[in-house]
């Protein structure tokens, strides 16, 4: 029986050109984490394997860094990075747990404020 739960940072926002840390945490289970996969809509970003360590997808090496911990750091963010990200925890004996994070990449704070507050 799967008793664990995944806690994530939920819905987050970051500025274009900046960085963001995607973080998930598996709790309420004694299952052993054998691997964590990070995906962006079906595209693999990275794998952290308990035995072999990190594998960063070659397609994302210029903009993805491993860690901290089992998390993932996205760098040089663009508006196209807006979307869903998934942490997929492979565990033994429980099986697979999946967490979801929604990232919104915003224009710089000046543009952001300009959109929110209009001068009468």
């Amino acid at each position: 029986m799967m008793t664990g739960t995944i806690e994530t940072t939920g819905n987050i926002s970051a500025e274009k050109g900046g960085s963001i840390i995607l973080q998930c945490h598996l709790s309420s289970t004694t299952a052993q984490v054998t691997q964590v996969n990070w995906e962006q809509q079906d595209q693999l970003l990275a794998i952290c394997n308990a035995d072999l360590g990190w594998h960063i997808s070659p397609s994302f090496k210029d903009r993805v860094a491993p860690g901290p911990g089992l998390g993932l750091t996205l760098q040089s963010l663009t508006v196209n990075d807006t979307g869903e990200y998934f942490c997929i925890y492979h565990t033994y004996p429980d099986g697979t747990y999946t967490g979801r994070i929604f990232l919104e990449v915003l224009e710089s704070s000046v543009a952001e404020h300009g959109a929110r507050f209009q001068i009468p």
């Epitope: 691997q35 693999l44 072999l52 360590g53 594998h55 960063i56 070659p58 860094a65």
Partner: antibody
Amino acid sequence: QVQLVQSGAEVKKPGASVKVSCKASGYTFTNYWIHWVKQAPGQGLEWIGDIYPGGRYSNYNEKFRGRVTLTADTSTSTVYMELSSLTSEDTAVYYCARYYESAMDFWGQGTTVTVSS
Amino acid sequence: DIVMTQSPDSLAVSLGERATINCKSSQNLLYNSNQKSYLAWFQQKPGQPPKLLIYWASTRESGVPDRFSGSGSGTDFTLTISSLQAEDLAVYYCQQYYNYPFTFGAGTKLELK
């Protein structure tokens, strides 16, 4: 010990398809990527694509995309490369190789595919 | 695609002498997060699959004799055989595995002088 054993030589007619297998042993099959590399007679090495048996991930060289399909059968620890619409340009030795993050460290013995009418 | 340029195309060296093969990448292969260059060197003999010699530009694969060494970072790399043995006569390839598609150099044929 780690071993990658490939299927035997194939002779095919132009327009046909070929399916080459690569059976892995001696390690946890689902932990490593399997890459495929082509070597035409007297030529260098050309990367075709890779597949991760521990997930649904695969990547292809654009040159082969649409003609090559990589699949994995975890029950038999075997990866398959299917190449369709064969031409004489596909006559080559095809290798599978194991990879994680540091390099392609173990290679199969190679499978010779000859395309001839 | 990242282009790997190997030189020379062929190299004739006497037994016991040093052999040096160069490889230049059209793009940087150094990954900032781990400060490793994603470059490997392979040896291939006729009728055999390639054999991994060096990975991460300078790390010798287990079981490879210490006369083989790799150096370089970023875009310029070198494979050195300090004292050529008869069994070293082969074709040598560099390969980048930084980004898709993975690409190989055209190869350097090492022959006896």
